[in-house]
């Protein structure tokens, strides 16, 4: 079976205040079974940005329909970008577990930074 890879193609994403940013993430395998979550940062302060299963994320939408069985695209859009949104974003695969899911593999991260203001 093919080993799962987490692909975040952009190392750097320049965004504009007030606009919508798209953070890309695709996986190369449907296995292991379990969700893909989005985080900002690493370590103790790692912040949950999107979890399809629980929570309220009013500014985040998915690019694809995550409920489709064969979906391998876990990209997200973040609307109404502000300077507080800068940082490095990671899509992270969890393996289904009991009682809790276990982190399996992280993408390499995409750094979101502010680009030039629109003229």
């Amino acid at each position: 079976e093919e080993e799962l890879q987490m692909i975040q193609p952009e190392k750097l994403l320049l965004v504009t205040v007030g606009k919508t940013a798209t953070l890309h993430c695709t996986v190369t395998s449907l296995l292991p079974v379990g969700p893909v979550l989005w985080f900002r940062g690493v370590g103790p302060g790692r912040e949950l940005i999107y979890n399809q299963k629980e929570g309220h994320f009013p500014r985040v939408t998915t690019v694809s329909d995550l409920t489709k069985r064969n979906n391998m695209d876990f990209s997200i859009r973040i609307s109404s970008i502000t300077p507080a949104d800068v940082g490095t974003y990671y899509c992270v695969k969890f393996r289904k577990g009991s009682p809790e899911n276990v982190e399996f593999k992280s993408g390499p991260g995409t750094e979101m930074a502010l680009g030039a203001k629109p003229s």
Epitope: P44, R46, G87
Partner: antibody
Framework: DVQLVESGGGLVQPGGSLRLSCTAS????????MSWVRQAPGEGLEWVSA???????YYTDSVKGRFTISRDNSKNTLYLQMNSLRAEDTAIYYC???????????WGLGTLVTVSS | EIVLTQSPGTLSVSPGERVTLTCRAS??????IAWYQQKPGQAPRLLIY???SRATGIPGRFSGSGSGTEFTLTITSLQSEDFAVYYC??????????FGGGTKVEIK
């Protein structure tokens, strides 16, 4: 407004146990890293433990195996279970919210833990 | 573990003076330094992060600078409410997160 309120401190004998609580409000608790930072009387700040927004846990070496950090997202509460307490654990224990790049943007007022016979 | 050394340990100054506090790291930390103010009987308060970014609500007289291993916190025209202990913290390496020993700014 972000608010962090610690409780559970007190006087305990060496070798004893104590559980600290930190109740949070004003932000989406489950999404963020939370931490405990302590300050011995008249001394500086020392990071103790943290629980990230993904539920991962982190400890400074001196408390590993003795302290356990946990959280109940449904109650917006962070805990620190402290076992095998030592005199050198005597300190004010602060609960702090951790930013995504690992500094502390909000702090509680602290709760005093005294380990003495 | 990254060790942070703050100097001086105590600084005696008069209101209105300009104050510069130093924090040195035992290795390069890519500008990942935060500064906190703590008054007696109170919790620390975030002043500066990423070496030079002011936290929300912090007055403009507080500024941070530095790179590599040496960082400074400057308070221009010290106010009476600025007498406190100031701590630096590195947020580069989180295993573990570490603080400096603090600098006490007291009234001359």
């Amino acid at each position: 407004d972000v608010q962090l309120v610690e409780s559970g401190g007190g006087l305990v004998q060496p070798g004893g146990s104590l559980r600290l609580s930190c109740t949070a409000s004003g932000f989406t608790f489950r999404n963020y890293g939370m931490s405990w930072v302590r300050q011995a009387p008249g001394e500086g700040l020392e990071w103790v433990s943290a629980s990230s927004g993904s539920g991962s846990t982190y400890y400074t070496d001196s408390v590993k195996g003795r302290f356990t950090i946990s959280r109940d997202n449904s109650k917006n509460t962070l805990y620190l279970q402290m076992n095998s307490l030592r005199a050198e654990d005597t300190a004010i224990y602060y609960c702090a919210k951790v930013t995504w790049n690992n500094f502390f943007d909000y702090w509680g007022l602290g709760t005093l833990v005294t380990v003495s016979s | 573990e990254i060790v942070l050394t703050q100097s001086p340990g105590t600084l005696s100054v008069s209101p209105g003076e300009r104050v510069t506090l130093t924090c040195r790291a035992s290795q390069g930390i890519a500008g990942k330094i935060a500064w906190y103010q703590q008054k007696p009987g109170q919790a620390p308060r975030l002043l500066i992060y990423d070496a030079s970014s002011r936290a929300t609500g912090i007055p403009g007289r507080f500024s941070g600078s530095g790179s590599g291993t040496e960082f400074t916190l400057t308070i221009t025209s010290l106010q009476s409410e600025d007498f406190a202990v100031y701590y630096c913290q590195q947020h580069y390496d989180w295993s573990p997160l570490t603080f400096g020993g603090g600098t006490k700014v007291e009234i001359k």
